[in-house]
Interface confidence: low
């Protein structure tokens, strides 16, 4: 579909691009000696960036620290030192900058306070960091302030003494609503879920915690779970891992009504050394990783039904090192249904796998055209692409960035990888897919930092090097041709690329420092590509593209989860602006149903390489554990259940005799008599 990338030669050079970019390159030198810099975007399409620099000297008795705060309101072209707005206070970098949701314009900075103080101190802004108000807290925060997704005036925080504190007026006043809290999270509709320890401490009571809920910011409470190990929220599901009565194992329970009623998930139980992890969740379903016993570094991915109760095995030997460890699981946001992850083979080699149908089937990534198989390949003509993600980064391989995709840059996926039978420890190259992962091409030789601008209209890259750099590369044709631009005559030690989240901007900021014998000076260069894409895209610049198309002759071509989508996409040859207001235009159409649109319901399974669901053997010797809403149920099924999010209509309807699965529920979790309500009066 596409040739190997070319850099400068053999490519349609853009006229006068050097002059255009030179006129739109803005340098800012930061007048401080800080050791670290953190950057946050405030709001969407506001152009406001906050930069916090910190300088810390650990002395024998105390540590001396200094912070500086800078603000830009033009996407990083110019910065103003606003440290005076926070009274030149040292800001605790471990709390970061707490930026409010959506376009609230809210920012909270947590200050360092002296040892004997009664509580912490924060600086609050609600006008995109134009002004800050200093507020002394009645507690020492343990975590960053958490905004309610529904109302940015509502905040929660945990204190160092495990108190749960809530503010209803953007941190001006605080109230401790509960003590002995281990973990707290905002749910929908300003609900707060939290676990509490009853006897000793969070660590000692693990597996004996209680799960509580408050729907009125701490006026009243309801205990919605006991014997809790941990809990999590994903999509519309609330999950809790609950200790079994008889042993030290635990099981996942799920609720779709904020904890009023619970069902036992049909997932394996796990022991003390194992873990569950929600890999991804949406309003329809959840991907759940269940760790294998022993220190194997892998487990199994299961995908749920629409209730979050019945799970199908999706992928074996899924790489996931330890609790809170590394997994390469990646949601490819540029195409519906696509996920990439890694598996650990018997020989301990790591291989990449991709699914195009939300975990229904996994396969190897297709070998890029015109690429050679590396030393890991047994057969030099047959191999596949393997993607470097979090695990490779954690192993300090020469991988500066994880895979990148953006919802508004349809079909584009950029990642470091190698071509062979498994991930290679050799220096990787950068590969690109323009069709959501079906086909790949080498984009750049060697490791690079990369980012997407103007909804895919421009891709920018900088070589990963331990030497100072002064060249930025860019492509206006989805990575086929590359131009190089020298953005400064004085090379800098590069530390990062920054562009506004959402990939709609045409500005990119290159961060780094210059170092002389005694000083290090932070510097940023912001390059605006607006004059490269000088005209607005017009009708002829776009073409229609059928996503997931693999067999154009087939009437079901492009059907994934019961429907196909046709997109309007920018032609590679068009050099024009999608613009900040660009919204992906797509036309969905429904597909007829087939057995692929159904998963096997409780008590049924699909034998290897079969499409029909067959009833499970009677599982003699132990009862099926099926607990729906915490009490014995009469479950009826025809063995099939529509895959979550599947929109197929007509076609094949797997009608068969409806069975009555009268099974004893073996879970006494949340026996209704155990539920109680409390009032905080």
């Amino acid at each position: 579909r596409r040739g190997a990338p070319a850099e400068d030669q053999d490519c349609g050079r853009l006229p006068d691009f050097i002059a255009k970019l030179t006129n739109n390159t803005h340098q800012h030198v930061f007048d401080d000696l800080s050791g670290s810099v953190s950057l946050s975007w405030v709001g969407d399409s506001t152009g406001v960036i906050l930069v916090l620099t910190t300088f810390q000297v650990p002395l024998v008795i105390v540590s001396f620290g200094q912070s500086k705060l800078y603000r830009s309101e033009d996407y990083g072209k110019n910065f103003k030192d606003i440290t005076n707005l926070i009274n030149n206070t040292f800001i605790r970098t471990e709390f970061g900058m707490a930026i409010g949701p959506e376009n609230s314009g809210k920012v909270i900075l947590t200050a360092e306070v002296s040892g004997g103080s009664r509580g912490g101190r924060v600086f609050r802004s609600s006008d995109f960091a134009k002004n800050f108000v200093q507020t002394d807290l009645p507690f020492h925060p343990l975590t960053q302030m958490m905004y309610s997704p529904q109302n940015s005036d509502y905040l929660l925080a945990l204190s160092t003494e495990n108190g749960l504190w809530v503010s209803k007026n953007f941190g001006e006043k605080w109230e401790e609503i509960h003590k002995a809290v281990c973990l707290a999270k905002w749910g929908p509709n300003n609900i707060i879920f939290f676990t509490t320890h009853v006897n000793g401490s969070c660590k000692a009571d693990l597996g004996a915690l209680e799960l509580w809920r408050t729907s009125d910011l701490g006026k009243t409470f309801k205990t919605i779970g006991v014997k809790i190990y941990s809990f999590g929220l994903g999509g519309r599901f609330l999950f809790a891992s609950v200790m079994a009565d008889k042993d030290t194992t635990r099981r996942i329970h799920v609720s779709t009504d904020q904890g009023d009623t619970w069902s036992m998930a049909q997932l394996p139980s796990v022991g003390q050394e194992q873990f569950y992890s929600i890999l991804a969740a949406n309003e329809d379903m959840v991907f759940m990783h269940v760790d294998e016993p022993g220190d194997t570094g892998f487990g199994t991915i299961f995908t749920s039904d629409d209730r979050g109760i019945v799970y199908s095995k999706s992928l074996d030997r899924h790489l996931y090192t330890t609790t809170g460890g590394e997994t390469d699981f990646t949601n490819v946001t540029s195409l519906r249904g696509v996920y990439i992850t890694s598996t650990l083979s018997e020989d301990n080699s790591i291989q990449s796998m991709i699914t195009f149908d939300q975990g229904g089937r996994w396969e190897h990534l297709r070998k890029p055209e015109n690429s050679k198989c590396d030393a890991t390949a047994k057969n030099k003509n047959e191999c596949s692409l393997h993607i470097h993600a979090s695990y490779s980064i954690s192993q300090k391989l020469n991988v500066p960035m994880a895979p990148l995709s953006e919802p508004n840059a349809v079909g584009i996926v950029i990642a470091h990888g190698s071509v062979g039978d498994a991930i290679s420890v050799m220096v990787p190259d950068v590969y690109i897919s323009d069709d959501g992962g079906y086909s790949w091409a080498k984009m750049l030789e060697g490791p690079h930092y990369y980012t997407i601008l103007d909804s895919g209209g421009i891709i920018v890259a900088i070589e990963h090097s331990n030497r100072p750099i002064n060249v930025i590369k860019f492509s206006t044709d989805e990575g086929q041709c590359w131009q190089s631009y020298v953005f400064t005559q004085e090379p800098i030690y590069f530390t990062g690329l920054a562009s506004e989240p959402g990939a709609r901007s045409m500005n990119i900021s290159i961060w780094g420092f210059t170092e002389s014998f005694i000083t290090r000076q932070w510097v940023s260069y912001t390059v605006d590509f607006k004059d490269i894409l000088e005209r607005n895209c017009e009708e002829d610049d776009y073409t229609t593209w059928l996503a997931h198309s693999t067999d154009p002759g087939d009437y079901k071509d492009g059907c994934i989860l019961g429907y196909k989508e046709q997109f309007l996409r920018l032609r590679k040859s068009s050099v024009c602006q999608n613009g900040r207001d660009y919204v992906v235009a797509k036309q969905p159409s429904v597909c007829p149903c087939s057995l692929e649109d159904f998963l096997c319901d409780f008590g049924y399974f699909r034998p290897e390489n079969a499409s029909e669901c067959v009833e499970q053997p009677e599982l003699k010797g132990h009862e099926l554990e099926f607990c729906l809403y915490g009490k014995e149920e009469h479950l009826t099924t025809n063995g099939y259940r529509k895959i979550p999010g599947d929109k197929c209509q007509g076609g094949m309807n797997p009608a068969r005799e409806v069975k009555d699965l009268k099974k004893k529920c073996t879970s006494n979790f949340l026996n209704p008599t155990k539920q109680n309500s409390k009032s905080n009066s």
Epitope: N578, G579, D581, Y582, V583
Partner: antibody, heavy 126, light 107 residues
Framework: QVQLVQSGAEVKKPGSSVKVSCKAS????????ISWVRQAPGQGLEWMGG????????SYAQKFQGRVTITADESTSTAYMELSSLRSEDTAVYYC???????????????????WGQGTTVTVSS | DIQMTQSPSSLSASVGDRVTITCRAS??????LNWYQQKPGKAPKLLIY???SLQSGVPSRFSGSGSGTDFTLTISSLQPEDFATYYC?????????FGGGTKVEIK
């Protein structure tokens, strides 16, 4: 240069429906958003809804939801607006208009409408 | 829906005059504002898009400014063919909404 030519004037009884057509000529039709805007006698302009023909799906103002249907036929480069349950206050000139830029913007009509039909007068009277 | 308020609703001016029409949005609409000119019995004509960008073919005596909630259409030197009704239109929120119009008449 694109031109939009609308169907002729209509006189309708209350409770009935009217369907107005808008044919594009002299340029491409499919990918631009086509809006329908009405203007009651002596009054201002009111956006009713729009469609991007290539995608078929229409977007409607809440006020007209359930009463208006906007469709497009790519093969004849024609857009249609049907308004049902007519009442006297629906008496107006109905215009079709083309969004001035390609619809990166889905069903939000950001950059204004640069090509307009000549207008179709619909009179609702018993 | 976002309300658009134009003022004045009508004005009288002479050829060569500088004319200013204002439009206020009920909430911030960034720069998603367009201006149209309409003559009796005719369809509207797009003059300005994105608050300040002049539509192709429109004379340079027309200019637009503003962002957020307050916007202005200025005709630097009124010509005989400029006597018409002018409408502003916001396109930040759905549905797009128009102002009530400003009628520019001959003094």
């Amino acid at each position: 240069q694109v031109q939009l030519v609308q169907s002729g004037a209509e006189v309708k009884k209350p409770g009935s429906s009217v369907k107005v057509s808008c044919k594009a000529s002299g340029g491409t039709f499919s990918s631009y958003a086509i809006s329908w805007v009405r203007q009651a006698p002596g009054q201002g302009l009111e956006w009713m809804g729009g469609i991007i023909p290539i995608f078929g799906t229409a977007s409607y103002a809440q006020k007209f939801q359930g009463r208006v249907t906007i469709t497009a036929d790519e093969s004849t480069s024609t857009a249609y607006m049907e308004l049902s349950s007519l009442r006297s206050e629906d008496t107006a000139v109905y215009y079709c208009a083309r969004e001035s830029r390609i619809p990166g913007s889905g069903y939000y009509y950001y950059y204004g409408m640069d090509v307009w039909g000549q207008g179709t007068t619909v009179t609702v009277s018993s | 829906d976002i309300q658009m308020t134009q003022s004045p609703s009508s004005l009288s001016a002479s050829v060569g005059d500088r004319v200013t029409i204002t439009c206020r949005a009920s909430q911030s609409i960034s720069s998603y504002l367009n201006w149209y000119q309409q003559k009796p019995g005719k369809a509207p004509k797009l003059l300005i898009y994105s608050a300040s960008s002049l539509q192709s073919g429109v004379p340079s005596r027309f200019s637009g400014s503003g962002s957020g909630t307050d916007f202005t259409l200025t005709i630097s030197s009124l010509q005989p063919e400029d006597f018409a009704t002018y409408y502003c239109q916001q396109t930040d929120g759905k549905p797009p909404t128009f102002g009530g119009g400003t009628k520019v008449e001959i003094k």
